[in-house]
Interface confidence: medium
């Protein structure tokens, strides 16, 4: 039914062996539940366990590589431990009645055996050279070839649990983590925003004067316009930073590169999986060769949408790492229906996770020079920030939106509230920005007083 892993891909039956069939039939009735056993074990000093039939006796646990054959007969007497048989192991001191079965590397997943199973260590499986692990569950991974980044450059090299991150050359876009020629880009696809429109040859009567002069006039005109634009942008950034420091309290900008500095060609937002080290959910993002995902939501033309009316589209799906499956022990989520913005000052203001307007309001009202500090405080790593910048290289706001969307997806619903953002902004001395965000979303009349939000 609700299996913690895919059938036929079951992990070593550690839980099963702990919970059923471990004890001989004569002892089963006397063994307390696991929780009770833990409580009772704590009565004995470390390295000892309580005798299942006589709780005044503490027996010595068995060393790794062995299992419990018979409990100690009395205080100070040895526990009868036997070595694990071939094909089984125990990796730590224990009082298990059976050793654990050795794992087998899964050939259909491309896995190879790094080291064989021994009495005190399970089989170690891995991937071949120039391959990476794509995790489907905590212990189940599939091996894929690292991308070579043909027609592009390696932005982040292939790692044990992460594919290469490619940056495509001009005239190419990223699809399935491969750089594909823009000539293969159809209008309906996501690549349209990455492939600049090709200037079509205008057929007409050949006028030698026009053919020479017109391109020159256009060229110089464009140069002037771009210089003007750069100048305006520079002044705008300075003005915006100054304004923020006035409006949003004590703003001491970080001396670090802003997101605008990213000039590399962005990765196509690609919602397939990518590996994640260990069991910590990190949401950096890299595609997997097996499949590419495309959003059914249509992209609004232009690199940066109009923020007055943000498009009804969530940031690129799964801007994040692979599915690391929590095992059957993973805690079940606390049911928490989505709360809309409400006028009540007594309820925590929960972000409407399906409404981009909320996230865009945050993007618009946090000073650009403090942005990286802000998302770091929300828990994003530098690696994730860099990757999201790269993926949205042409548009600062979209990169920032993606970072917030990543935070929102990783944070339990109950915690993804304006209250949490408020705490972070308050810690950054940017309380004024929080008020701006609230005002942008609700209008001054609908808002509860700010202090009640941040209590």
């Amino acid at each position: 039914m609700g299996l913690s892993t895919v059938p036929d891909l079951l992990l070593p039956l550690v839980l099963l062996e702990l919970l059923v069939g471990i004890y001989p039939s004569g002892v089963i009735g006397l063994v307390p539940h696991l929780g009770d056993r833990e409580k009772r074990d704590s009565v004995c000093p470390q390295g000892k366990y309580i005798h299942p039939q006589n709780n005044s006796i503490c027996c010595t646990k068995c060393h790794k590589g062995t299992y419990l054959y018979n409990d100690c007969p009395g205080p100070g007497q040895d526990t009868d431990c036997r070595e694990c048989e071939s094909g089984s192991f125990t990796a730590s001191e224990n009082h298990l009645r059976h050793c654990l079965s050795c794992s087998k590397c899964r050939k259909e997943m491309g896995q190879v055996e790094i080291s064989s199973c021994t009495v005190d260590r399970d089989t170690v499986c891995g991937c071949r050279k120039n391959q990476y692990r794509h995790y489907w569950s905590e212990n189940l991974f599939q091996c894929f070839n690292c991308s070579l980044c043909l027609n592009g450059t390696v932005h982040l090299s292939c790692q044990e649990k992460q594919n290469t991150v490619c940056t495509c050359h001009a005239g190419f876009f990223l699809r399935e983590n491969e750089c594909v020629s823009c000539s293969n880009c159809k209008k309906s696809l996501e690549c349209t925003k990455l492939c600049l429109p090709q200037i079509e040859n205008v057929k007409g009567t050949e006028d030698s004067g026009t053919t020479v002069l017109l391109p020159l006039v256009i060229f110089f005109g464009l140069c002037l316009l771009s210089l003007l634009f750069i100048g305006l942008m520079y002044r705008y950034q300075r003005w915006k930073s100054k304004l923020y420091s006035i409006v949003c309290g004590k703003s001491t900008p970080e001396k670090e590169g802003e997101l605008e500095g990213t000039t590399t060609k962005p990765l196509a937002p690609n919602p397939s999986f990518s590996p994640t080290p260990g069991f910590t959910p990190t949401l950096g993002f890299s595609p997997v060769p097996s499949s590419t995902f495309t959003s059914s939501s249509t992209y609004t033309p232009g690199d940066c949408p109009n923020f007055a009316a943000p498009r009804r589209e969530v940031a690129p799906p799964y801007q994040g790492a692979d599915p690391i499956l929590a095992t059957a022990l993973a805690s079940d989520p606390i049911p928490n229906p989505l709360q809309k913005w409400e006028d009540s000052a007594h309820k925590p203001q929960s972000l409407d996770t399906d409404d981009p307007a909320t996230l865009y309001a945050v993007v618009e009202n946090v000073p650009p020079l403090r942005w990286k500090e802000f998302v770091r405080r929300l828990g994003l790593s530098d690696h994730e920030i860099d990757r999201l910048e790269l993926q949205n290289g042409r548009c600062l706001r979209e990169a920032q939106y993606s970072m917030l969307a990543t935070w929102r997806r990783r944070t339990p619903r109950r915690e993804a509230t304006l209250e949490l953002l408020g705490r972070v902004l308050r810690d950054m001395d940017l309380l004024g920005c929080l008020e701006d965000i609230e005002e942008a979303l609700c209008g001054p009349a609908a808002l509860p007083p700010a202090p009640s939000l941040l209590r």
């Epitope: 609700g2 299996l3 913690s4 489907w136 569950s137 999986f273 959910p281 949401l283 959003s295 059914s296 939501s297 009804r312 589209e313 969530v314 799906p317 799964y318 994040g320 790492a321 692979d322 599915p323 690391i324 499956l325 929590a326 095992t327 993973a330 805690s331 079940d332 989520p333 606390i334 049911p335 928490n336 229906p337 989505l338 996770t353 399906d354 997806r409 990783r410 339990p412 619903r413």
Partner: nanobody, 120 residues
């Protein structure tokens, strides 16, 4: 207890259609994005499709784009996969998967799977 129960699989001819269902229980269905993942015989796992909590946004693998449609009915706690223009390479066990609480893209529960066989 979280339970995901797939149904609707079976034998179908190339070009035919099937609709898979996944009945969910034991958690607040509307709070989670949901996904379909498949495993062809003797092969690794492959992503098929994903849908957001409200059913507004859907995402597909290139291999199924334009042929498969994912949908959900939050009032019935059910996830669907409408499969049209089926091909032999779509033969696989299809799993319905629920993300864990800490991030939408890490799965902690899968159904038992339903076998789809496309053959003439």
């Amino acid at each position: 207890e979280v339970q995901l129960l797939e149904s609707g699989g079976g034998l179908v001819q190339p070009g035919g259609s099937l609709r898979l269902s996944c009945a969910a229980s034991g958690f607040t269905f509307a709070d989670y994005q949901m996904a379909w993942v498949r495993q062809a015989p003797g092969k690794g796992l492959e992503w098929v499709s994903r849908i957001d909590r409200g059913g507004f946004h859907t995402y597909y693998a290139d291999s199924v784009k334009g042929r498969f449609t994912i949908s959900r009915d939050n009032s019935k706690n059910t996830l669907y996969l409408q499969m049209n223009s089926l091909r032999a390479e779509d033969t696989a066990v299809y799993y319905c998967a629920k993300p864990s609480w800490h991030a939408d893209q890490y799965f902690d529960y899968w159904g038992q799977g339903t076998l789809v066989t496309v053959s003439s």
